[in-house]
Interface confidence: medium
């Protein structure tokens, strides 16, 4: 899986669903977050 | 306002060291992961090395072509990001960067410092 | 290491039309795809990530698409700003990499 900056700060976001790529209508961000590329 | 400003660049002879310096402010730097990313003269972007936050026990990681050589290192009471450059070679030679992605209110938050340039030549 | 392969390195187009940039990856990447603008003398600007999200305040005529291996930036109508070079790059597995770049010059 993947452990990186971004897949967790999208991951905090709620950007991703559990499957992972698929962007959702609507997520609840949070301030929890982590850096890269 | 986030704002990341890179210092301690300079002429230096291979063989040599240098630290350099990244001064945040606008965000609560101890909560982020923070990147180097570098840019030789006339050439495309390459990451450098990551250091995660506090809570995750400032863990790094490193490009295979600067492992062993330069160390990345924080200090959150001082909102300061570091890379220290030993053994430098002339291919070091380049423009460091840096960056920091999060996420914070509503969206995707990134921001770059404006570079500092590293010359390694004799 | 994933490698990043852009295309065309230099692509030659006029204000008003449009720019498709290619990004594909040596490996699956699934959608941790951004792309940078970077002009001469300037830090990168991120304008899109999660290879379609568009970033805070970049115009709408820019566009992401993608997913896996393959990638797209499109610029619907270019405008004269629009003229930079602009790289790809993943984060999906460290080391982060980025693509070679490809300049976007005027006509």
């Known amino acids: 899986s993947c452990n990186t900056a971004t897949c967790v700060t999208h991951r905090l976001a709620g950007l991703l669903s559990r499957s992972g790529g698929v962007v959702k209508d609507n997520f609840v961000p949070t301030n929890v977050g982590s850096e890269a590329f | 306002e986030v704002q990341l400003v890179e210092s301690g660049g300079g002429l230096v002879q291979p063989g040599g060291s240098l630290r350099l310096s990244c001064a945040a402010s606008g965000f609560t730097f101890s909560n982020y992961w923070i990147s180097w990313v570098r840019q030789a003269p006339g050439k495309g972007l390459e990451w450098v090395a990551e250091?995660?936050?506090?809570?995750?026990?400032?863990?790094?990681h490193y490009a295979e072509a600067v492992k062993g050589r330069f160390t990345i290192s924080r200090d959150n009471a001082k909102n300061s990001l570091y890379l220290q450059m030993n053994s430098l070679r002339a291919e070091d030679t380049a423009v460091y960067y840096c960056?920091?992605?999060?996420?914070?209110?509503?969206?995707?938050?990134?921001?770059w410092g404006q570079g500092t340039l590293v010359t390694v030549s004799s | 290491e994933i490698v990043l392969t852009q295309s065309p390195a230099t692509l030659s187009l006029s204000p008003g039309e449009r720019a498709t940039l290619s990004c594909k990856a040596s490996?699956?990447?699934?959608?941790?795809v951004s792309w940078y603008q970077q002009k001469p003398g300037q830090a990168p600007r991120l304008l899109i990530y999660g290879a379609s999200n568009r970033y805070l305040g970049i115009p709408a005529r820019f566009s992401g698409s993608g997913s896996g291996t393959d990638f797209t930036l499109t610029i619907s109508s270019l405008e004269p700003e629009d003229f930079a070079v602009y790289y790809c790059s993943q984060s999906y597995n460290y080391p982060y990499t980025f693509g070679q770049g490809t300049k976007l010059e005027i006509k």
């Open positions: 250091i995660r936050s506090e809570s995750d026990a400032s863990a790094t």
């Open positions: 960056a920091v992605y999060f996420d914070y209110g509503l969206a995707i938050q990134n921001y």
């Open positions: 490996k699956r990447v699934t959608t941790y």
